[in-house]
């Protein structure tokens, strides 16, 4: 039996850059059973990840991963050196950021240790796999009666980021959303100051430096209201 | 072995114009941005402008937003910059850059663009 499977995931080129490979096999056997897909993801460009869901082999299975990077000068195949575990079974592995090459096509191999010739390949464009942390130190600035402006801080270089904005009022059931680009700035024309506002903000990996389809975690909530009473309609910000 | 050679700086008066390019050899250009750095007299290394691999998305510093203009030439496994309305506080030393402009790897030597009237 022997298969190839094209898996697009939304990291496709002109030619797929996510596939996976098992190796022939002479009879109907273990060896004849898909491994778990790998799923790598590369946090804020410091480590990366790459998982699998160990509890889909049908029994408790220590796979193994090897790596390289393809027509590159980082062409030698590795060993994982840090496993993540399950249960005491490896479902990963964490490479640091001296072995992460954005640019360069990342193949990666799973490995049944006990049925060599069962493995899986895949090649990943980890440029589109990148995962910042969200935005911190979120601020609020009073430019005029009734505008506002809103910053914040990404630990990593802006240009290469853009952002989503949601905010609301107490009184509205959902988020309004606002897409803005690597400048990072915000602002809101018309303020209502009888209503207290949230804001919050999230960030993604795209599209100067990478296609990344996955945003981060969403900042922590930033508030700006007005104490009810009439008499004194100050505005105030308070962080959560 | 990677290699970046920029040229096209001058001297130049205040609202003067320059083109400034930057061959790159040894490593896969189109796959990677590429960044525009310069550096003036005692300071340290500025960002001015990344572009994205197929040139579809560009990025510039609020200092040339506007009088810049960065562009690539995948063909020719080139960078540009375009520097339009130029200021005496553009006088620097233009360094291009592999990637996205983290400061690694070392650009190449610069090409010198002196403002002055």
């Known amino acids: 039996l022997n298969t190839t499977i094209l898996t697009p995931n939304g990291n496709e080129d002109t030619t797929a850059d996510f596939f996976l490979t098992t190796m022939p096999t002479d009879s109907l056997s273990v060896s004849t059973l898909p491994l778990p897909e790998v799923q790598c993801f590369v946090f804020n460009v410091e480590y990366m990840n790459c998982t699998w869901n160990s509890s889909s082999e049908p029994q408790p299975t220590n796979l193994t991963l090897h790596y390289w990077y393809k027509n590159s000068d980082n062409d030698k195949v590795q060993k994982c050196s840090h496993y993540l575990f399950s249960e005491e079974i490896t479902s990963g592995c964490q490479l640091q950021k001296k072995e992460i090459h954005l640019y360069q096509t990342f193949v990666v191999q799973l490995q049944d240790p006990r049925e060599p010739r069962r493995q899986a390949t895949q090649m990943l464009k980890l440029q589109n796999l990148v995962i910042p942390w969200a935005p911190e130190n979120l601020t609020l600035h009073k430019l005029s009666e009734s505008q506002l402006e809103l910053n914040w801080n990404n630990r990593f270089l802006n240009h290469c980021l853009e952002h989503l904005v949601q905010y609301r009022t107490d009184w509205d059931h959902s988020w309004t959303e606002q897409s803005v680009d690597y400048r990072h700035k915000f602002s809101l024309p018309s303020v209502d100051g009888q209503k207290r506002y949230t804001f919050r903000v999230r960030s993604r990996f795209n599209p100067l430096c990478g296609s990344a389809q996955h945003w981060s975690e969403w900042s922590h909530p930033i508030h700006w209201g007005s104490n009810t009473s009439k008499e004194n309609p100050f505005l105030f910000a308070l962080e959560a | 072995q990677v290699q970046l050679q920029e040229s096209g700086g001058g001297l130049v008066q205040p609202g003067g114009s320059l083109r400034l390019s930057c061959a790159a050899s040894g490593f896969s250009f189109s796959s990677y941005p590429m960044t525009w750095a310069r550096q003036a007299p005692g300071k340290g290394l500025e960002w001015v402008s990344t572009?994205?691999?197929?040139?579809?998305?560009?990025a510039y510093a609020a200092s040339v937003e506007g009088r810049f203009t960065i562009s690539r030439d995948n063909a020719k496994s080139t960078l540009y910059l375009q520097l339009n309305s130029l200021k005496t506080e553009d006088t620097a030393m233009y360094y291009c850059?592999?990637?996205?402009?983290?400061?690694?790897?070392?650009p190449g030597q610069g090409t010198q663009v002196t403002v002055s009237s």
């Open positions: 572009i994205a691999s197929d040139g579809g998305s560009t």
């Open positions: 850059t592999k990637g996205y402009g983290d400061g690694t790897p070392a």
